[in-house]
Interface confidence: low
Protein backbone atom coordinates (compact mmCIF):
# COMPACT_ATOMS: atom_id res chain seq x y z
CA UNK A 1 0.00 0.00 0.00
CA UNK A 2 1.28 3.48 -0.78
CA UNK A 3 1.41 6.15 1.86
CA UNK A 4 -0.11 8.78 -0.42
CA UNK A 5 -2.95 10.86 0.87
CA UNK A 6 -5.29 12.77 -1.40
CA UNK A 7 -3.12 15.44 -2.93
CA UNK A 8 -4.38 18.77 -4.14
CA UNK A 9 -1.81 20.56 -6.21
CA UNK A 10 -2.57 23.37 -8.64
CA UNK A 11 0.61 25.36 -8.74
CA UNK A 12 1.32 28.41 -10.83
CA UNK A 13 4.49 29.67 -12.38
CA UNK A 14 6.20 32.68 -10.88
CA UNK A 15 7.89 34.41 -13.81
CA UNK A 16 8.11 37.57 -11.73
CA UNK A 17 6.52 39.11 -8.70
CA UNK A 18 2.79 39.49 -9.29
CA UNK A 19 3.14 39.70 -13.04
CA UNK A 20 -0.27 39.68 -14.64
CA UNK A 21 0.10 37.47 -17.67
CA UNK A 22 -2.25 38.62 -20.36
CA UNK A 23 -3.99 35.95 -22.34
CA UNK A 24 -3.39 38.03 -25.45
CA UNK A 25 0.36 38.34 -24.95
CA UNK A 26 1.99 38.95 -28.33
CA UNK A 27 5.48 37.98 -27.27
CA UNK A 28 5.50 34.63 -28.98
CA UNK A 29 2.65 33.44 -31.08
CA UNK A 30 2.66 29.85 -32.34
CA UNK A 31 0.00 28.05 -34.30
CA UNK A 32 -2.13 25.48 -32.55
CA UNK A 33 -0.45 22.08 -32.30
CA UNK A 34 2.97 23.66 -32.78
CA UNK A 35 5.60 23.52 -30.06
CA UNK A 36 7.02 26.73 -28.65
CA UNK A 37 10.62 26.53 -27.44
CA UNK A 38 13.13 29.33 -26.93
CA UNK A 39 10.88 31.64 -28.93
CA UNK A 40 10.81 29.41 -31.95
CA UNK A 41 7.78 27.45 -33.11
CA UNK A 42 8.10 23.90 -34.36
CA UNK A 43 5.63 21.63 -36.07
CA UNK A 44 6.56 18.01 -35.47
CA UNK A 45 4.70 15.89 -37.97
CA UNK A 46 3.29 12.48 -37.26
CA UNK A 47 2.68 11.91 -40.96
CA UNK A 48 5.38 10.77 -43.37
CA UNK A 49 6.03 12.76 -46.54
CA UNK A 50 8.70 13.05 -49.22
CA UNK A 51 11.24 15.83 -48.73
CA UNK A 52 9.57 18.04 -51.35
CA UNK A 53 6.10 17.47 -49.95
CA UNK A 54 7.42 18.32 -46.52
CA UNK A 55 9.03 21.51 -47.80
CA UNK A 56 5.78 22.63 -49.42
CA UNK A 57 3.71 21.82 -46.34
CA UNK A 58 5.99 23.95 -44.20
CA UNK A 59 5.99 26.78 -46.75
CA UNK A 60 2.18 26.74 -46.82
CA UNK A 61 2.29 27.67 -43.14
CA UNK A 62 4.80 30.50 -43.58
CA UNK A 63 7.53 28.35 -42.11
CA UNK A 64 10.39 26.31 -43.48
CA UNK A 65 11.79 22.85 -43.00
CA UNK A 66 13.94 22.83 -39.89
CA UNK A 67 17.15 24.83 -40.07
CA UNK A 68 19.34 23.97 -37.11
CA UNK A 69 21.34 26.61 -35.29
CA UNK A 70 23.12 23.99 -33.18
CA UNK A 71 22.76 20.33 -32.30
CA UNK A 72 21.03 20.97 -28.99
CA UNK A 73 18.31 23.11 -30.55
CA UNK A 74 15.85 20.24 -30.22
CA UNK A 75 17.11 18.94 -26.91
CA UNK A 76 13.54 18.89 -25.59
CA UNK A 77 12.97 15.89 -27.85
CA UNK A 78 16.45 14.39 -27.77
CA UNK A 79 15.09 11.00 -26.73
CA UNK A 80 12.99 10.67 -29.89
CA UNK A 81 13.86 7.64 -32.00
CA UNK A 82 12.46 9.20 -35.15
CA UNK A 83 14.32 10.77 -38.06
CA UNK A 84 12.81 13.90 -39.59
CA UNK A 85 13.37 15.70 -42.86
CA UNK A 86 15.17 19.00 -42.37
CA UNK A 87 15.70 21.93 -44.73
CA UNK A 88 19.12 20.97 -45.97
CA UNK A 89 19.86 20.15 -49.61
CA UNK A 90 22.91 20.05 -51.84
CA UNK A 91 23.45 22.92 -54.25
CA UNK A 92 25.35 21.93 -57.41
CA UNK A 93 25.76 25.61 -58.19
CA UNK A 94 27.53 26.35 -54.91
CA UNK A 95 28.92 22.84 -54.46
CA UNK A 96 27.78 23.00 -50.85
CA UNK A 97 25.03 21.83 -48.53
CA UNK A 98 22.70 24.79 -48.05
CA UNK A 99 19.79 25.54 -45.80
CA UNK A 100 16.58 26.78 -47.36
CA UNK A 101 17.54 30.40 -46.69
CA UNK A 102 20.72 29.92 -48.69
CA UNK A 103 23.17 29.79 -45.78
CA UNK A 104 25.82 27.10 -45.77
CA UNK A 105 25.90 24.14 -43.42
CA UNK A 106 28.42 24.59 -40.61
CA UNK A 107 31.01 21.85 -40.70
CA UNK A 108 30.69 21.56 -36.92
CA UNK A 109 27.01 20.67 -37.04
CA UNK A 110 27.35 17.30 -38.77
CA UNK A 111 31.01 16.24 -38.81
CA UNK A 112 30.12 13.37 -41.17
CA UNK A 113 28.47 15.61 -43.79
CA UNK A 114 31.29 14.99 -46.29
CA UNK A 115 30.12 11.39 -46.60
CA UNK A 116 26.56 12.42 -47.50
CA UNK A 117 25.38 11.47 -50.98
CA UNK A 118 24.77 14.82 -52.66
CA UNK A 119 21.79 13.43 -54.56
CA UNK A 120 20.01 12.71 -51.30
CA UNK A 121 18.16 14.75 -48.70
CA UNK A 122 18.98 14.87 -45.01
CA UNK A 123 16.97 13.32 -42.21
CA UNK A 124 17.81 14.33 -38.68
CA UNK A 125 17.30 12.70 -35.31
CA UNK A 126 17.04 15.19 -32.44
CA UNK A 127 19.76 13.47 -30.45
CA UNK A 128 22.18 14.90 -33.01
CA UNK A 129 22.43 12.22 -35.69
CA UNK A 130 21.88 12.93 -39.37
CA UNK A 131 21.74 10.63 -42.37
CA UNK A 132 21.20 11.05 -46.09
CA UNK A 133 18.24 9.32 -47.72
CA UNK A 134 16.59 9.41 -51.11
CA UNK A 135 14.46 12.54 -51.29
CA UNK A 136 11.59 10.37 -52.49
CA UNK A 137 11.61 8.36 -49.30
CA UNK A 138 8.89 9.27 -46.84
CA UNK A 139 9.81 10.59 -43.43
CA UNK A 140 8.26 12.66 -40.74
CA UNK A 141 9.34 16.30 -40.92
CA UNK A 142 9.80 19.36 -38.72
CA UNK A 143 8.78 22.87 -39.70
CA UNK A 144 10.23 25.87 -37.92
CA UNK A 145 9.17 29.48 -37.52
CA UNK A 146 11.61 31.86 -35.90
CA UNK A 147 9.70 34.43 -33.93
CA UNK A 148 12.47 36.80 -32.93
CA UNK B 1 -15.05 7.98 -21.95
CA UNK B 2 -12.86 7.41 -25.00
CA UNK B 3 -10.04 9.83 -25.60
CA UNK B 4 -10.83 12.70 -27.93
CA UNK B 5 -9.30 11.96 -31.32
CA UNK B 6 -7.68 14.90 -33.04
CA UNK B 7 -5.74 15.00 -36.27
CA UNK B 8 -2.22 16.25 -35.77
CA UNK B 9 -0.85 15.11 -39.09
CA UNK B 10 -0.36 18.36 -40.99
CA UNK B 11 0.72 21.82 -39.95
CA UNK B 12 -2.42 23.37 -41.43
CA UNK B 13 -4.00 24.62 -38.23
CA UNK B 14 -5.44 27.82 -36.94
CA UNK B 15 -3.34 30.33 -35.08
CA UNK B 16 -3.48 30.72 -31.34
CA UNK B 17 -1.30 32.31 -28.69
CA UNK B 18 1.31 29.84 -27.52
CA UNK B 19 2.11 32.02 -24.50
CA UNK B 20 5.72 31.01 -24.75
CA UNK B 21 7.83 33.96 -23.66
CA UNK B 22 5.59 35.52 -21.07
CA UNK B 23 3.90 32.42 -19.77
CA UNK B 24 6.46 29.63 -19.61
CA UNK B 25 9.83 29.70 -17.92
CA UNK B 26 12.91 29.58 -20.11
CA UNK B 27 13.79 26.09 -21.32
CA UNK B 28 10.21 24.86 -20.92
CA UNK B 29 8.18 24.13 -24.03
CA UNK B 30 4.65 25.19 -24.87
CA UNK B 31 2.13 22.98 -26.60
CA UNK B 32 -1.63 23.36 -26.85
CA UNK B 33 -2.02 25.86 -24.03
CA UNK B 34 0.25 24.06 -21.58
CA UNK B 35 3.83 24.50 -20.46
CA UNK B 36 6.03 21.42 -20.09
CA UNK B 37 9.29 20.93 -18.27
CA UNK B 38 11.20 18.21 -20.10
CA UNK B 39 13.13 16.35 -17.41
CA UNK B 40 16.36 14.49 -18.02
CA UNK B 41 16.91 13.14 -14.51
CA UNK B 42 15.38 10.03 -12.94
CA UNK B 43 13.35 10.02 -9.74
CA UNK B 44 10.86 7.82 -7.93
CA UNK B 45 7.20 8.76 -8.46
CA UNK B 46 6.93 10.61 -5.18
CA UNK B 47 10.26 12.39 -5.68
CA UNK B 48 9.05 13.41 -9.14
CA UNK B 49 5.85 14.78 -7.66
CA UNK B 50 7.84 16.89 -5.22
CA UNK B 51 10.32 17.96 -7.91
CA UNK B 52 7.49 19.34 -10.04
CA UNK B 53 5.93 21.05 -7.03
CA UNK B 54 9.27 22.73 -6.36
CA UNK B 55 9.14 24.01 -9.93
CA UNK B 56 5.69 25.46 -9.23
CA UNK B 57 4.03 22.98 -11.56
CA UNK B 58 2.47 19.51 -11.47
CA UNK B 59 3.67 16.08 -12.44
CA UNK B 60 2.76 15.40 -16.07
CA UNK B 61 -0.91 14.80 -16.76
CA UNK B 62 -2.39 13.45 -19.98
CA UNK B 63 -5.67 15.04 -20.97
CA UNK B 64 -6.43 13.39 -24.32
CA UNK B 65 -5.04 10.95 -26.80
CA UNK B 66 -3.75 13.65 -29.13
CA UNK B 67 -1.63 15.01 -26.28
CA UNK B 68 -0.49 11.52 -25.34
CA UNK B 69 0.59 10.79 -28.91
CA UNK B 70 2.45 14.06 -29.18
CA UNK B 71 4.26 13.62 -25.88
CA UNK B 72 5.08 9.98 -26.53
CA UNK B 73 6.61 10.93 -29.89
CA UNK B 74 9.11 13.32 -28.35
CA UNK B 75 9.60 12.04 -24.79
CA UNK B 76 11.01 8.89 -23.24
CA UNK B 77 8.91 6.84 -20.82
CA UNK B 78 8.02 9.05 -17.89
CA UNK B 79 5.92 9.23 -14.76
CA UNK B 80 2.50 10.83 -14.94
CA UNK B 81 0.49 12.25 -12.06
CA UNK B 82 -1.72 9.21 -11.55
CA UNK B 83 -1.52 6.62 -8.78
CA UNK B 84 -3.61 4.30 -6.61
CA UNK B 85 -3.28 3.32 -2.97
CA UNK B 86 -3.37 -0.38 -3.82
CA UNK B 87 -4.62 -2.67 -6.56
CA UNK B 88 -7.98 -2.68 -4.77
CA UNK B 89 -8.27 1.08 -5.12
CA UNK B 90 -9.17 3.08 -8.21
CA UNK B 91 -6.58 5.02 -10.18
CA UNK B 92 -6.72 8.69 -9.24
CA UNK B 93 -4.96 11.89 -10.28
CA UNK B 94 -2.75 13.78 -7.86
CA UNK B 95 -5.88 15.70 -6.83
CA UNK B 96 -7.61 12.50 -5.83
CA UNK B 97 -9.95 12.68 -8.82
CA UNK B 98 -10.97 9.50 -10.60
CA UNK B 99 -8.70 8.77 -13.59
CA UNK B 100 -10.86 7.50 -16.38
CA UNK B 101 -8.41 6.19 -18.98
CA UNK B 102 -7.06 2.68 -19.35
CA UNK B 103 -3.79 1.82 -17.63
CA UNK B 104 -2.04 -1.34 -18.76
CA UNK B 105 -0.96 -4.02 -16.25
CA UNK B 106 -3.40 -2.76 -13.62
CA UNK B 107 -3.92 -6.28 -12.30
CA UNK B 108 -0.39 -6.37 -10.86
CA UNK B 109 -0.68 -5.46 -7.15
CA UNK B 110 2.92 -4.19 -6.99
CA UNK B 111 2.46 -1.56 -9.69
CA UNK B 112 0.58 1.42 -8.32
CA UNK B 113 1.98 4.43 -10.15
CA UNK B 114 1.40 5.29 -13.80
CA UNK B 115 3.84 5.83 -16.64
CA UNK B 116 3.50 7.21 -20.16
CA UNK B 117 5.16 4.72 -22.48
CA UNK B 118 5.02 4.91 -26.28
CA UNK B 119 1.40 5.88 -26.81
CA UNK B 120 0.03 4.03 -23.84
CA UNK B 121 -0.33 4.37 -20.10
CA UNK B 122 1.20 1.62 -18.02
CA UNK B 123 1.47 0.85 -14.32
CA UNK B 124 4.88 0.68 -12.66
CA UNK B 125 6.48 0.32 -9.24
CA UNK B 126 6.26 3.66 -7.49
CA UNK B 127 9.74 3.24 -6.02
CA UNK B 128 11.50 2.70 -9.33
CA UNK B 129 13.47 5.56 -10.84
CA UNK B 130 12.14 7.06 -14.05
CA UNK B 131 12.34 10.24 -16.04
CA UNK B 132 9.71 12.78 -15.05
CA UNK B 133 8.19 15.79 -16.77
CA UNK B 134 6.16 18.62 -15.31
CA UNK B 135 3.20 20.48 -16.77
CA UNK B 136 1.20 23.61 -16.18
CA UNK B 137 -2.04 24.32 -18.03
CA UNK B 138 -2.34 27.88 -19.23
Amino acid sequence: KNSFTKLSIEPAFTPGPNIELQKDSDCCSCQEKWVGYRCNCYFISSEQKTWNESRHLCASQKSSLLQLQNTDELDFMSSSQQFYWIGLSYSEEHTAWLWENGSALSQYLFPSFETFNTKNCIAYNPNGNALDESCEDKNRYICKQQLI
Amino acid sequence: IPFLEQNNSSPNTRTQKARHCGHCPEEWITYSNSCYYIGKERRTWEESLLACTSKNSSLLSIDNEEEMKFLASILPSSWIGVFRNSSHHPWVTINGLAFKHKIKDSDNAELNCAVLQVNRLKSAQCGSSMIYHCKHKL
Epitope: A12, K23 | I1, N56
Partner: antibody, heavy 119, light 107 residues
Framework: EVQLVESGGGLVQRGGSLRLSCAAS????????MNWIRQAPGKGLEWVAH????????YYADSVKGRFTISRDNAKNSLSLQMNSLRDEDTAVYYC????????????WGQGTMVTVSS | EIVLTQSPATLSLSPGERATLSCRAS??????LAWYQQKPGQAPRLLIY???NRATGIPARFSGSGSGTDFTLTISSLEPEDFAVYYC?????????FGPGTKVDIK
Protein backbone atom coordinates in the same frame (compact mmCIF):
# COMPACT_ATOMS: atom_id res chain seq x y z
CA GLU C 1 -14.63 21.63 7.30
CA VAL C 2 -13.83 23.21 3.93
CA GLN C 3 -15.30 26.68 3.91
CA LEU C 4 -15.30 29.94 1.95
CA VAL C 5 -16.88 33.02 3.50
CA GLU C 6 -17.38 36.22 1.50
CA SER C 7 -17.72 39.69 2.98
CA GLY C 8 -17.63 43.34 1.93
CA GLY C 9 -20.84 43.54 -0.09
CA GLY C 10 -23.26 46.40 0.26
CA LEU C 11 -24.84 49.41 -1.41
CA VAL C 12 -22.56 51.59 -3.54
CA GLN C 13 -23.11 54.53 -5.86
CA ARG C 14 -22.68 54.13 -9.61
CA GLY C 15 -19.03 54.88 -10.44
CA GLY C 16 -17.98 54.04 -6.90
CA SER C 17 -15.67 51.34 -5.54
CA LEU C 18 -16.00 48.33 -3.27
CA ARG C 19 -13.64 45.63 -2.06
CA LEU C 20 -14.88 42.10 -1.50
CA SER C 21 -13.03 39.56 0.61
CA CYS C 22 -13.21 35.79 0.88
CA ALA C 23 -11.82 33.93 3.89
CA ALA C 24 -10.81 30.31 3.23
CA SER C 25 -10.48 27.54 5.81
CA UNK C 26 -10.29 23.76 5.97
CA UNK C 27 -7.95 23.28 3.01
CA UNK C 28 -4.51 24.31 1.77
CA UNK C 29 -5.51 27.63 0.29
CA UNK C 30 -2.08 28.28 -1.24
CA UNK C 31 -2.41 25.17 -3.44
CA UNK C 32 -5.62 26.14 -5.18
CA UNK C 33 -6.70 28.51 -7.90
CA MET C 34 -9.56 30.77 -6.87
CA ASN C 35 -12.33 32.58 -8.71
CA TRP C 36 -15.06 35.14 -8.34
CA ILE C 37 -18.41 34.32 -9.91
CA ARG C 38 -21.51 36.53 -9.78
CA GLN C 39 -25.23 36.19 -10.22
CA ALA C 40 -27.47 39.16 -10.96
CA PRO C 41 -30.92 39.01 -9.30
CA GLY C 42 -33.08 36.43 -11.08
CA LYS C 43 -30.33 35.73 -13.63
CA GLY C 44 -27.76 33.04 -14.34
CA LEU C 45 -24.16 32.63 -13.25
CA GLU C 46 -21.32 34.70 -14.71
CA TRP C 47 -17.64 33.99 -14.10
CA VAL C 48 -15.77 37.20 -13.21
CA ALA C 49 -12.09 36.49 -12.50
CA HIS C 50 -9.52 33.76 -11.87
CA UNK C 51 -6.25 33.82 -9.92
CA UNK C 52 -3.78 30.94 -9.75
CA UNK C 53 -2.29 29.69 -6.50
CA UNK C 54 0.83 31.83 -6.78
CA UNK C 55 -0.93 34.87 -8.30
CA UNK C 56 1.05 34.60 -11.54
CA UNK C 57 -1.91 33.69 -13.73
CA UNK C 58 -4.77 36.18 -13.60
CA TYR C 59 -7.72 36.28 -15.99
CA TYR C 60 -10.87 38.41 -16.17
CA ALA C 61 -14.19 38.31 -17.98
CA ASP C 62 -14.35 40.98 -20.69
CA SER C 63 -17.19 42.69 -18.84
CA VAL C 64 -14.96 43.62 -15.88
CA LYS C 65 -11.52 43.93 -17.49
CA GLY C 66 -9.78 47.14 -16.45
CA ARG C 67 -12.26 47.81 -13.62
CA PHE C 68 -11.90 44.82 -11.30
CA THR C 69 -8.71 43.44 -9.73
CA ILE C 70 -8.45 40.00 -8.18
CA SER C 71 -5.73 39.34 -5.60
CA ARG C 72 -4.89 36.92 -2.84
CA ASP C 73 -2.86 36.71 0.35
CA ASN C 74 -1.84 33.10 0.90
CA ALA C 75 -0.40 33.86 4.34
CA LYS C 76 -3.85 35.03 5.45
CA ASN C 77 -5.88 32.45 3.44
CA SER C 78 -7.67 35.38 1.87
CA LEU C 79 -8.98 36.27 -1.61
CA SER C 80 -10.04 39.78 -2.63
CA LEU C 81 -11.85 41.51 -5.47
CA GLN C 82 -11.32 45.25 -5.83
CA MET C 83 -14.20 46.67 -7.87
CA ASN C 84 -13.87 50.18 -9.33
CA SER C 85 -16.05 52.26 -11.69
CA LEU C 86 -19.06 50.20 -10.70
CA ARG C 87 -22.02 50.05 -13.08
CA ASP C 88 -25.68 49.14 -12.62
CA GLU C 89 -25.06 45.81 -14.31
CA ASP C 90 -22.50 44.87 -11.63
CA THR C 91 -25.38 44.46 -9.15
CA ALA C 92 -25.24 40.79 -8.17
CA VAL C 93 -24.47 38.23 -5.52
CA TYR C 94 -20.70 37.63 -5.69
CA TYR C 95 -19.42 34.15 -4.86
CA CYS C 96 -15.83 33.10 -4.35
CA UNK C 97 -15.15 29.58 -5.58
CA UNK C 98 -12.25 27.16 -5.60
CA UNK C 99 -11.32 25.22 -8.71
CA UNK C 100 -9.16 22.14 -8.52
CA UNK C 101 -6.43 21.73 -11.11
CA UNK C 102 -7.48 19.26 -13.77
CA UNK C 103 -11.26 19.42 -13.47
CA UNK C 104 -12.03 22.85 -14.99
CA UNK C 105 -14.92 23.25 -12.55
CA UNK C 106 -15.73 25.05 -9.31
CA UNK C 107 -16.01 22.47 -6.57
CA UNK C 108 -16.19 24.66 -3.44
CA TRP C 109 -18.35 27.80 -3.21
CA GLY C 110 -18.93 30.45 -0.59
CA GLN C 111 -22.43 31.54 0.40
CA GLY C 112 -22.12 34.81 -1.54
CA THR C 113 -22.21 38.52 -0.73
CA MET C 114 -24.65 40.98 -2.30
CA VAL C 115 -23.41 44.07 -4.13
CA THR C 116 -26.00 46.67 -5.12
CA VAL C 117 -25.03 49.54 -7.40
CA SER C 118 -27.47 52.43 -7.18
CA SER C 119 -27.84 55.51 -9.30
CA GLU D 1 -15.99 33.00 -26.65
CA ILE D 2 -17.75 29.65 -26.43
CA VAL D 3 -21.49 30.01 -25.87
CA LEU D 4 -23.45 27.34 -24.01
CA THR D 5 -27.15 26.80 -24.74
CA GLN D 6 -29.36 24.79 -22.38
CA SER D 7 -32.67 23.18 -23.15
CA PRO D 8 -35.38 23.11 -22.17
CA ALA D 9 -35.54 26.36 -20.20
CA THR D 10 -38.03 24.72 -17.84
CA LEU D 11 -38.77 21.06 -17.23
CA SER D 12 -41.94 20.19 -15.31
CA LEU D 13 -41.82 16.69 -13.86
CA SER D 14 -43.09 14.66 -10.91
CA PRO D 15 -40.98 12.96 -8.24
CA GLY D 16 -39.80 9.56 -9.44
CA GLU D 17 -39.68 10.63 -13.08
CA ARG D 18 -36.53 10.75 -15.18
CA ALA D 19 -35.10 14.19 -16.05
CA THR D 20 -32.97 14.74 -19.14
CA LEU D 21 -31.27 18.13 -19.46
CA SER D 22 -29.31 19.21 -22.50
CA CYS D 23 -26.35 21.56 -22.91
CA ARG D 24 -24.92 22.49 -26.32
CA ALA D 25 -21.63 24.31 -26.90
CA SER D 26 -21.10 26.65 -29.86
CA UNK D 27 -17.83 24.83 -30.56
CA UNK D 28 -16.14 21.72 -29.21
CA UNK D 29 -15.09 21.74 -25.57
CA UNK D 30 -14.01 18.07 -25.74
CA UNK D 31 -15.10 16.74 -22.32
CA UNK D 32 -14.39 19.91 -20.34
CA LEU D 33 -17.95 20.44 -19.14
CA ALA D 34 -19.42 20.62 -15.65
CA TRP D 35 -22.95 20.63 -14.23
CA TYR D 36 -24.18 22.48 -11.15
CA GLN D 37 -27.36 22.46 -9.11
CA GLN D 38 -28.64 25.65 -7.47
CA LYS D 39 -31.54 25.98 -5.08
CA PRO D 40 -33.13 29.35 -4.18
CA GLY D 41 -30.99 31.39 -1.80
CA GLN D 42 -28.11 28.92 -1.98
CA ALA D 43 -24.75 28.79 -3.74
CA PRO D 44 -24.43 26.40 -6.68
CA ARG D 45 -23.19 22.88 -6.01
CA LEU D 46 -20.92 20.95 -8.37
CA LEU D 47 -22.59 17.75 -9.58
CA ILE D 48 -20.55 16.56 -12.55
CA TYR D 49 -17.11 17.49 -13.91
CA UNK D 50 -15.37 16.40 -17.10
CA UNK D 51 -18.79 15.67 -18.63
CA UNK D 52 -19.36 12.40 -16.79
CA ASN D 53 -17.56 12.29 -13.44
CA ARG D 54 -19.70 12.68 -10.34
CA ALA D 55 -18.29 15.09 -7.78
CA THR D 56 -17.71 13.91 -4.21
CA GLY D 57 -20.93 13.13 -2.35
CA ILE D 58 -23.23 13.35 -5.37
CA PRO D 59 -25.84 10.55 -5.49
CA ALA D 60 -25.66 7.95 -8.24
CA ARG D 61 -29.00 9.06 -9.70
CA PHE D 62 -27.12 11.99 -11.28
CA SER D 63 -25.15 11.12 -14.40
CA GLY D 64 -23.53 13.09 -17.19
CA SER D 65 -22.68 12.14 -20.74
CA GLY D 66 -21.54 13.62 -24.02
CA SER D 67 -18.42 15.12 -25.56
CA GLY D 68 -17.57 17.73 -28.14
CA THR D 69 -20.60 20.01 -28.39
CA ASP D 70 -23.52 17.99 -27.01
CA PHE D 71 -23.91 17.08 -23.36
CA THR D 72 -26.65 15.61 -21.19
CA LEU D 73 -27.35 15.58 -17.49
CA THR D 74 -29.70 12.79 -16.45
CA ILE D 75 -31.46 12.42 -13.12
CA SER D 76 -32.70 8.84 -13.19
CA SER D 77 -35.48 9.23 -10.64
CA LEU D 78 -36.30 12.68 -9.29
CA GLU D 79 -36.27 13.13 -5.53
CA PRO D 80 -38.13 16.07 -3.96
CA GLU D 81 -34.80 17.78 -3.20
CA ASP D 82 -33.76 17.66 -6.89
CA PHE D 83 -36.17 20.40 -7.96
CA ALA D 84 -33.80 23.28 -8.65
CA VAL D 85 -32.00 25.16 -11.43
CA TYR D 86 -29.21 23.32 -13.26
CA TYR D 87 -26.34 25.06 -15.03
CA CYS D 88 -23.68 23.70 -17.35
CA UNK D 89 -20.23 25.33 -17.50
CA UNK D 90 -17.09 25.07 -19.61
CA UNK D 91 -13.56 26.43 -19.59
CA UNK D 92 -11.59 27.34 -22.69
CA UNK D 93 -8.32 29.31 -22.58
CA UNK D 94 -9.12 30.41 -19.04
CA UNK D 95 -12.43 31.92 -20.01
CA UNK D 96 -15.19 30.16 -18.10
CA UNK D 97 -18.76 30.35 -19.35
CA PHE D 98 -22.06 29.11 -17.95
CA GLY D 99 -25.22 28.10 -19.73
CA PRO D 100 -28.41 30.08 -18.98
CA GLY D 101 -29.78 27.26 -16.82
CA THR D 102 -32.66 24.78 -16.87
CA LYS D 103 -35.27 24.99 -14.15
CA VAL D 104 -36.64 21.64 -13.02
CA ASP D 105 -39.93 22.24 -11.24
CA ILE D 106 -42.70 20.08 -9.84
CA LYS D 107 -45.54 19.32 -12.24
Amino acid sequence: EVQLVESGGGLVQRGGSLRLSCAASGFTFSSNSMNWIRQAPGKGLEWVAHISSGSSFIYYADSVKGRFTISRDNAKNSLSLQMNSLRDEDTAVYYCARDDWGIDAFNIWGQGTMVTVSS
Amino acid sequence: EIVLTQSPATLSLSPGERATLSCRASQSVSSSLAWYQQKPGQAPRLLIYDASNRATGIPARFSGSGSGTDFTLTISSLEPEDFAVYYCQQRSNWIFTFGPGTKVDIK
